[in-house]
Amino acid sequence: DALPSSEDDDDDDDSSSEEKETDNTKPNPVAPYWTSPEKMEKKLHAVPAAKTVKFKCPSSGTPNPTLRWLKNGKEFKPDHRIGGYKVRYATWSIIMDSVVPSDKGNYTCIVENEYGSINHTYQLDVVERSPHRPILQAGLPANKTVALGSNVEFMCKVYSDPQPHIQWLKHIEVNGSKIGPDNLPYVQILKHSGINSSDAEVLTLFNVTEAQSGEYVCKVSNYIGEANQSAWLTVTRPALEERPAVMTSPLYLE
């Protein structure tokens, strides 16, 4: 692999944590790290056919890390797509022109040197601009294991044209049964996107109890179709030794 510059072209300030190299000393080794993680937050890219896609993984490390790309977990070679692709090592990016439906998939950048390896995955969907069913970002909502009394946030990233209706549901039991007479699971609607519902893509649970453990579903629909993805919440009691000790001796104030 070609070696990109360890400078991050996206950052004007010098945020490097490395020690500057002097004439006589070798720089301290630094495992790869993201220099602009906030620019990598958008994971789902829904792009019309024929447009250009640019994925970036701005990084640094000492020595200079290498950059390589996978598609759906496998080595991605230019001859794997019509028109190939361009890797811009100076800006830690891959560019694919004139995308087509066969370009759909997960694209992973791997940045590594001898002191470590980091990776990040983007999801590409090639869409018709005309109305389509909702698309949900893979891996969201994510499973959570939290302590009793904690607050929990589930997130669902949605791409939809037209405007989608978002519901958060929880699978429940009725009279000891999870399935109703209509052969559909019993669910409780926890939240839905209405006129006044802000941030419908996020479900927040406060001060959770063990009874709130279970499966939570993000269900998104528009007039063309629907999509849903679910996650499990596990609420755990703290182990006995983790509980606060009960003070039996008197407290003396000096």
Epitope: A50, K51, K56
Partner: antibody, heavy 116, light 109 residues
Framework: QVQLQESGPGLVKPSGTLSLTCAVS?????????WSWVRQPPGKGLEWIGE???????SYNPSLKSRVTISVDKSKNQFSLKLSSVTAADTAVYYC?????????WGQGTLVTVSS | SYVLTQPPSVSVAPGQTARITCGGN??????VHWYQQKPGQAPVLVVY???DRPSGIPERFSGSNSGNTATLTISRVEAGDEADYYC???????????FGGGTKLTVLG
């Protein structure tokens, strides 16, 4: 190589409808491209109007969306622009262009004047 | 909607280097394209995908893009380079094309 040629009336009355056609030669309008309209008022910059894919899928400039219709005729290998309720502010050179993420080539442009 | 900001004018002496900037929020995440337009003519693509040149465009034309600024660089400027230059992106968030306001390049002398 692909060439584009705009045609249509050079003069349109206020409140009327501007209609232009772009003929595509040297390539198929059914290729993986967006077929676009861009305009340039006299002495001013370029303004994107909208675009169409051969499937009929469209995207329009929000500031013009209520007045714009772009259509494609695959049998004639051409696409068209209709802009309704025109005013003097719509006087411009109108270009058609082939687009992926960028535009190449462009038509030579046609001046449309809105005047009574 | 996404806004691209260009300086209205840039002046340079023949043989020198001209740099035309195009500012936009996190523009480094987008692919930027540049057009040259001479009076009475249609625009011509001179740089695409930040830094690639179409065939027939001299090597003197180059581009870069990072952070909040994309730059078109014209080295060894010639009198024939005098024109208006426009940057353009496809804004993936709004799914719309956007042009900068244009920069008039004047070659002095």
């Amino acid at each position: 190589q692909v060439q584009l040629q705009e045609s249509g009336p050079g003069l349109v009355k206020p409140s009327g409808t501007l209609s232009l056609t772009c003929a595509v030669s040297g390539g198929s309008i059914s290729s993986n491209n967006w077929w676009s309209w861009v305009r340039q008022p006299p002495g001013k910059g370029l303004e994107w109007i909208g675009e169409i894919y051969h499937s009929g899928s469209t995207s329009y400039n929000p500031s013009l969306k209520s007045r714009v219709t772009i259509s494609v005729d695959k049998s004639k290998n051409q696409f068209s622009l209709k802009l309704s309720s025109v005013t003097a502010a719509d006087t411009a050179v109108y270009y058609c262009a082939r687009g992926t993420d960028w535009y190449d080539p462009w038509g030579q442009g046609t001046l449309v004047t809105v005047s009574s | 909607s996404y806004v691209l900001t260009q300086p209205p004018s840039v002046s340079v002496a023949p043989g020198q280097t001209a740099r035309i900037t195009c500012g936009g929020n996190n523009i480094g995440s987008e692919s930027v394209h540049w057009y040259q337009q001479k009076p009475g003519q249609a625009p011509v693509l001179v740089v695409y995908d930040d830094s690639d040149r179409p065939s027939g465009i001299p090597e003197r034309f180059s581009g870069s893009n990072s952070g909040n600024t994309a730059t078109l660089t014209i080295s060894r400027v010639e009198a024939g380079d005098e024109a208006d230059y426009y940057c353009q992106v496809w804004d993936s968030t709004s799914d719309h094309r956007v042009f900068g306001g244009g920069t008039k390049l004047t070659v002095l002398g």
